[in-house]
Interface confidence: low
């Protein structure tokens, strides 16, 4: 409306004081904001209200610019001086003044509910008998939907520290700085941060894989809070090594060390299952022997079945866990023993028959010191430093000590072995990591299983 | 296990389009991120952008005008797309998988694209 | 951008000998962040060494890599008929994420 308009003395008398003085009336003039006629902002950020002067302003206009909340008299914000503005957005609201480009936009930082509001633009002269008043605009506050974003550069590695980055790119830099706080179970150091992100140094563990990490920002101008949360994707070499071992139909539960000596009957068909840990999962695979780095294998994955063991399957059998962050390999070692209808007689029979009896005498001696320890105690042995091992002479000439350590959820009654059990079956063995090239003597455990066939 | 395996069209006329597919097993493009890096004959290797395991994606500088890398995760493909091709093109595209701390742990086989009239 | 550059562009090494390849970055880049590869013609570049002196699954253990900020080095402590091979170090630490010019390790 381009028609002049009487403002109110009473609106009108504070800021134009020195026209009145002068004996003059203040006139007012109409003009229309540029763009939309409402504006949303998120809770704690900030929009700014776009303002041109009127085209029609004189070069030799000068004045200030005053920006009200609608029924106000008290202005949000302005370049004068001498006005005060409302305590509710001092500090937060800002006339942006460029006369010379005919700017008088308003800035709002900290966005607040209660700024949930029309406003509008004031220009007044203390030299000029008119000022200038624009259309109102409405600015909408919402409730903050944004969310931080958490990145990482490339892959989190067990025992390698990474810089983890929480932004808020959507936050604008003449806000409150916002309050970045980090929780996470892995260990963690600050880094630097900036108005919109905080870095976090995370040096993780293999037990804080799948483990949550979170960023929450606070918005203190606004006193707002949000947050995102990730599960931690860490990479980590195998630490240990399981195998399960199944002879025939049958399973029972063993805990073996390394290079651990199992004896199988000849003819008997087994499966050797490989299992690891690790992130991503270790490539498995198993070779006869021990191998060296370029090692063809004899099974490309965790299981290996020998269909019916014999001489040629007699030693060792080495399961290695590949992985990008180091590589754990564990061995067995097979041997076998004969059925005696399966040999000839003469000399090679007497072999067999002494090694036969020898085996069957030590077993017997093994099998009667676990039923006296099982009778002394009914709770699994959790340690093993009382136990007296009977020292036994491996395939190659190892000594390996075999300890009654592990028990199965249900131990067998103590009684006389028949004839239908006197077969011993073997499963899952875990292997703790072992250092690459620095072998340890280790103590191999066993326990008598019994299975109910 | 791990394998990665690019499939270009070769040859491409200058000006045109370049449109390199890798197929990706042995793991999920939404747990790892993928890199495409080429080596032009005689010359270094030279890092062209990434996808990242959200899907966002960063690019060289140089190419952020030509370049666009994109991905159909049930296919487990990623997709590269460099246009109005100039000879200096002319290189072995590789993809690879972001691995431990920013290595590309997992190469593909390469494949050679000429540009030429 | 991190300009990476790496010297000498060409090396010749007799069997057994020491080998030291360097690479320098114009700005500081984290150790974490940088990393060597190994290329032979014909192949595809393998991860070498990686977070400046960690050596990848099947790496021997006559390489080794030092340094921090913007000096970095890779040594091969006895020359082998099968390191002859193009080395590249590539830094991760800042976008866009660049690789040296190589060094080309010959048998003399």
């Known amino acids: 409306m381009q028609g002049a308009q009487e403002a109110s003395a009473s609106e009108m008398l504070p800021l134009l004081l020195p026209l009145l003085w002068a004996g003059a009336l203040a006139q007012e003039r109409r003009f229309q904001l540029e763009g939309p006629e409402s504006l949303t902002v998120q809770e704690g950020l900030c929009v700014l209200v776009p303002c041109r002067l009127p085209t029609t302003l004189p070069a030799s206009y000068y004045g200030y610019g005053y920006w009200f909340l609608e029924g106000a008299d008290v202005p949000v914000a302005t370049n004068d001086p001498d006005e005060e503005v409302q305590e509710e957005t001092r500090g937060r609201f800002h006339l942006l003044w460029d006369p010379r480009r005919k700017n008088c936009s308003l800035s709002i930082r900290d966005a607040r509910r209660r700024d949930n509001a029309a406003y509008f633009f004031r220009l007044k002269s203390k030299w000029m008998k008119y000022g200038y008043t624009s259309s109102k605009l409405s600015v909408r506050v919402m409730a903050l939907t944004h969310r931080p974003n958490i990145s990482i550069p490339g892959t989190l590695e067990s025992g390698h520290p990474s810089n983890l980055t929480c932004s808020v790119p959507w936050v604008c830099e003449q806000g409150t700085p916002p309050i970045f706080s980090w929780m996470s179970a892995a260990p963690t150091s600050l880094g630097p941060r900036t108005t919109q992100s905080s870095v976090l140094t995370i040096t993780p563990r293999p037990q804080d894989h799948s483990t949550n990490l979170t960023c929450q920002v606070t918005f203190p101008g606004a006193g707002v809070t949000m947050e995102r949360t990730i599960q931690l994707n860490v990479s980590y070499a195998p630490q240990k090594v399981a195998i399960s071992i199944f002879q025939g139909n049958s399973a029972a539960f063993k805990i073996l060390q390394n290079t651990s000596s199992l004896p199988v009957l000849e003819g008997q068909a087994l499966r050797l299952l490989c299992d690891a840990d690790g992130n991503p999962p270790a490539h498995l695979s198993w070779f006869q022997g021990f191998p060296a780095l370029n090692a063809t294998p004899i099974s490309n994955t965790g299981v290996l079945e020998l269909p019916q063991v014999g001489s040629a399957e007699e030693g060792d059998f080495t399961c290695r866990a590949q992985h990008p962050l180091g590589s754990l390999q564990i061995s067995l070692s097979l041997f076998v023993h004969w059925k005696p209808e399966g040999r000839a007689g003469g000399v090679l029979g007497a072999v067999w028959g002494a090694s036969i009896t020898t085996l069957v005498f030590l077993c017997v001696c093994f099998i009667f010191r676990v039923k006296t320890r099982r009778k002394k105690a009914a709770q699994p042995v959790q340690n093993t430093d009382d136990v007296n091992p009977v020292m036994v002479s491996g395939s190659r000439g190892h000594q390996h000590q075999f300890q009654t350590g592990i028990v199965s959820d249900h131990p067998a009654e103590a009684g006389p072995i028949s004839e239908d059990e006197q077969e011993l079956h073997y499963a899952v063995l875990h292997f703790h990591k072992v250092q690459p090239q620095e072998p340890k003597v280790t103590d191999t455990e066993y326990s008598e299983i019994k299975i109910h066939k | 296990q791990v394998q990665l395996k690019e499939s270009g069209p070769g040859l491409v006329a200058p000006s045109q389009s370049l449109s390199i597919t890798c197929t990706v097993s042995g793991f999920s493009l939404t747990s790892y991120g993928v890199s495409w890096v080429r080596k032009p004959p005689g010359k270094g290797l030279e890092w062209l952008g990434v996808i990242w395991h959200d899907g966002s994606t960063s690019y060289h500088s140089t190419l952020i005008s030509r370049l666009n890398i994109s991905r159909d995760n049930s296919k487990s493909q990623v997709f590269l797309k460099l246009n109005s091709l100039q000879t200096d093109d002319t290189a072995t595209y590789y993809c690879?998988?972001?691995?431990?701390?920013?290595?590309?742990?997992?190469w593909g086989q390469g494949t050679l694209v000429t540009v030429s009239a | 951008q991190i300009v990476v550059t790496q010297s000498p562009a060409i090396m010749s090494a007799s069997l057994g000998e020491r080998v030291t390849m360097t690479c320098t970055a114009s700005?500081?880049?984290?150790?974490?962040?940088l990393h060597w590869y190994q290329q032979k013609p014909g192949s595809s570049p393998k991860l070498w060494i990686y977070?400046?002196?960690i050596l990848a699954s099947g790496v021997p253990a006559r390489f080794s890599g030092s340094g921090s900020g913007t000096s970095y080095s890779l040594t091969v402590s006895s020359m082998e008929a099968e390191d002859a091979a193009t080395y590249y170090c590539?830094?991760?630490?800042?976008?866009?994420?660049?690789f040296g010019g190589g060094s080309k390790l010959e048998i003399r």
């Open positions: 700005s500081s880049v984290s150790s974490s962040y």
């Open positions: 977070s400046t002196s």
């Open positions: 690879a998988s972001d691995g431990y701390s920013g290595t590309f742990a997992y």
């Open positions: 590539h830094q991760y630490h800042r976008s866009p994420y660049t």
